[in-house]
């Protein structure tokens, strides 16, 4: 039975030209995290593999930095970066857990972080 939950930074906003940290945390499970994939729609941003380290997609190499931890830092933000981001935790033996973050990139300098909140996990087995 999958007992884990993913906590994310939730709905967040940031200023155009600035940077933002995307962060997820898996809790309430003893499953081993083998890999974390970061995606925007169907585009891969990065993978953090427990054995092999980080792979940043070539499309994002110049403005995505690994970390902190299993999180991801997006730099040089544009309004086109507005949208949904997903952290996909591949675990053993549980399977996959997925967290969602919505990022809004604002033209103004009034960008504020949304409250940290917990979302129900959804998952599938490979």
């Amino acid at each position: 039975m999958m007992t884990g939950t993913i906590e994310t930074t939730g709905n967040i906003s940031a200023e155009k030209g600035g940077s933002i940290i995307l962060q997820c945390h898996l809790s309430s499970t003893t499953a081993q995290v083998t890999q974390v994939n970061w995606e925007q729609q169907d585009q891969l941003l990065a993978i953090c593999n427990a054995d092999l380290g980080w792979h940043i997609s070539p499309s994002f190499k110049d403005r995505v930095a690994p970390g902190p931890g299993l999180g991801l830092t997006l730099q040089s933000l544009t309004v086109n970066d507005t949208g949904e981001y997903f952290c996909i935790y591949h675990t053993y033996p549980d399977g996959t857990y997925t967290g969602r973050i919505f990022l809004e990139v604002l033209e103004s300098s009034v960008a504020e972080h949304g409250a940290r909140f917990q979302i129900p996990h959804h998952h599938h087995h490979h």
Partner: antibody, heavy 120, light 106 residues
Framework: EVQLQESGPGLVKPSETLSLTCAVS????????WNWIRQPPGKKLEYIGY???????YYNPSLKSRVTISRDTSKNQFSLKLSSVTAADTAVYYC??????????????WGQGTTVTVSS | DIVMTQSPDSLAVSLGERATINCRAS??????IAWYQQKPGQSPKLLIY??SYRYTGVPRFSGSGSGTDFTLTISSLQAEDVAVYYC?????????FGGGTKVEIK
């Protein structure tokens, strides 16, 4: 130029252990990750597993109970052992190199492959 | 495991014409796709990684797609392109390959 060269017996008896070695030249095994892939006659490529630059291993769950991948950095080579073989393990076995940081799971330097037949 | 299905199984194309090979994943794999060329009696050679990025020194070949559907295109088929082409996903372990598409000259 990086070269990978597989070696080992071409014929293995059923129930015995298949042992192959991949010699790496022109590059140090202390970075990147090092893979084994096989291709049974007329079938698709099957991923066996890897050993990382730090010595950590991953094995395909379908073979996990029978596979061991190890390395000898002093000789710049890594090895595959597959126990309790059957005719279904007859295949061309390839070793290959991957650079996870730049190419993810895409493998870009391959050995020429060695054919292993399991038969009594 | 993620199942990769290629189509067609074989393809005959005239020299200088375009060849298109399709690959479908059993679940979304984002852009974590590689394409390989395997000529008779040789080992596979990497052509494309991250779905659309050409590996060093690879001409004529292009890749596209994301999610579950991917395409490898040879813009103008040459005699030396006769080979079997494989897609591979590395979204999750174990990495898995398609069944291959054989490209021949018509």
């Amino acid at each position: 130029e990086v070269q990978l060269q597989e070696s080992g017996p071409g014929l293995v008896k059923p129930s015995e252990t298949l042992s192959l070695t991949c010699a790496v030249s022109g590059y140090s095994m202390t970075s990147d990750y090092w893979n084994w892939i096989r291709q049974p006659p007329g079938k698709k490529l099957e991923y066996i597993g890897y050993i990382s630059y730090s010595g950590r291993t991953y094995y395909n769950p379908s073979l996990k109970s029978r596979v061991t991948i190890s390395r000898d950095t002093s000789k710049n080579q890594f090895s595959l052992k597959l126990s309790s073989v059957t005719a279904a393990d007859t295949a061309v076995y390839y070793c290959a190199r991957g650079d996870y940081s730049n190419y993810g799971g895409a493998m870009y330097d391959w050995g020429q492959g060695t054919t292993v037949t399991v038969s009594s | 495991d993620i199942v990769m299905t290629q189509s067609p199984d074989s393809l005959a194309v005239s020299l200088g014409e375009r060849a298109t090979i399709n690959c479908r994943a059993s679940q979304g794999v984002s852009t974590t796709i590689a394409w390989y060329q395997q000529k008779p009696g040789q080992s596979p050679k990497l052509l494309i990684y991250s779905a659309s990025y050409r590996y060093t020194g690879v001409p004529r070949f292009s890749g596209s797609g994301s999610g579950t559907d991917f395409t490898l295109t040879i813009s103008s088929l040459q005699a030396e392109d006769v080979a079997v082409y494989y897609c591979q996903q590395y979204y999750s372990s174990p990495f898995t390959f398609g069944g291959g598409t054989k490209v021949e000259i018509k």
